[in-house]
Amino acid sequence: APVPPGEDSKDVAAPHRQPLTSSERIDKQIRYILDGISALRKETCNKSNMCESSKEALAENNLNLPKMAEKDGCFQSGFNEETCLVKIITGLLEFEVYLEYLQNRFESSEEQARAVQMSTKVLIQFLQKKAKNLDAITTPDPTTNASLLTKLQAQNQWLQDMTTHLILRSFKEFLQSSLRALRQM
């Protein structure tokens, strides 16, 4: 698994470097998670042909994976810092159940999956410190999440492979949109 941000040898070797600002730390954290997702996607795509065939194979997706929309204020047109930050944090909180599902889905990248999950928790904490309007952030209901996790795990092998691919793809897209938006803040 890659070394978490702030623990690489370059940081140790450069004691006089300025400490990272809050924004830099968040940026670095997201890029670290994206690297982890890339590694997980590599294993998924090597293991099955889901990555090429998912478009033709899938007729309907009821996973309700978080997605950025115009109204969320994260795109350049209609950008709204506070609304967008709330959306990013809410979306990441909603992704947590899917990241939990991913934990037993990888053979050679088990540590990587855990690293993505834990780093996302840290990212949420960073972002919550940045947000002024924490009341607007809705936390997912644990009972609903537990029920969803049971359903995800009850799918057959083929559907679980498809689900894994869709989660990784959506999480990557969500983080990339978040990164672009946060760089405008």
Epitope: E60, A154, L159
Partner: nanobody, 125 residues
Framework: DVQLVESGGGLVQAGGSLRLSCAAS????????MGWFRQAPGKEREFVAA????????YYADSVKGRFTISRDNAKNTVYLQMNSLKPEDTAVYYC??????????????????WGQGTQVTVSS
């Protein structure tokens, strides 16, 4: 034990119609996707149509679009396939399939958990 039982197959002339039924027992499929697949002699099993358990949305293979209609009666735990304007190339064994969770609906056979034994449809020219 879950069972899917197809009926309604038979021999029909080109241009004719048939209505296939698939009765499910052993569990309720009201929130699950259901599909029809077919297999002609010497060919792979292919997707025909599917219906979502949640939205009731329907999906069709290009080869049957506009001629076949899939529907479901949740009270009877039954799925139907109305086949109109039948062609000789529709000749195959038709299988009903069910999926147990309903988060994803796919047109791939591997995405289904339960299968019927199949009903033969023969279209003569």
């Amino acid at each position: 034990d879950v069972q899917l039982v197809e009926s309604g197959g038979g021999l029909v002339q080109a241009g004719g119609s048939l209505r296939l039924s698939c009765a499910a027992s052993g569990r309720t499929f009201s929130s699950s996707p259901m599909g029809w697949f077919r297999q002609a002699p010497g060919k792979e099993r292919e997707f025909v149509a599917a219906i979502s358990g949640r939205s009731g949305n329907t999906y069709y293979a290009d080869s049957v679009k506009g001629r076949f209609t899939i529907s479901r009666d949740n009270a009877k735990n039954t799925v139907y396939l109305q086949m109109n304007s039948l062609k000789p190339e529709d000749t195959a064994v038709y299988y009903c399939a069910g999926e147990r969770v309903g988060l994803l609906l796919t047109v791939v056979a591997e995405g289904y958990d339960y299968w019927g034994q199949g009903t033969q449809v023969t279209v003569s020219s």
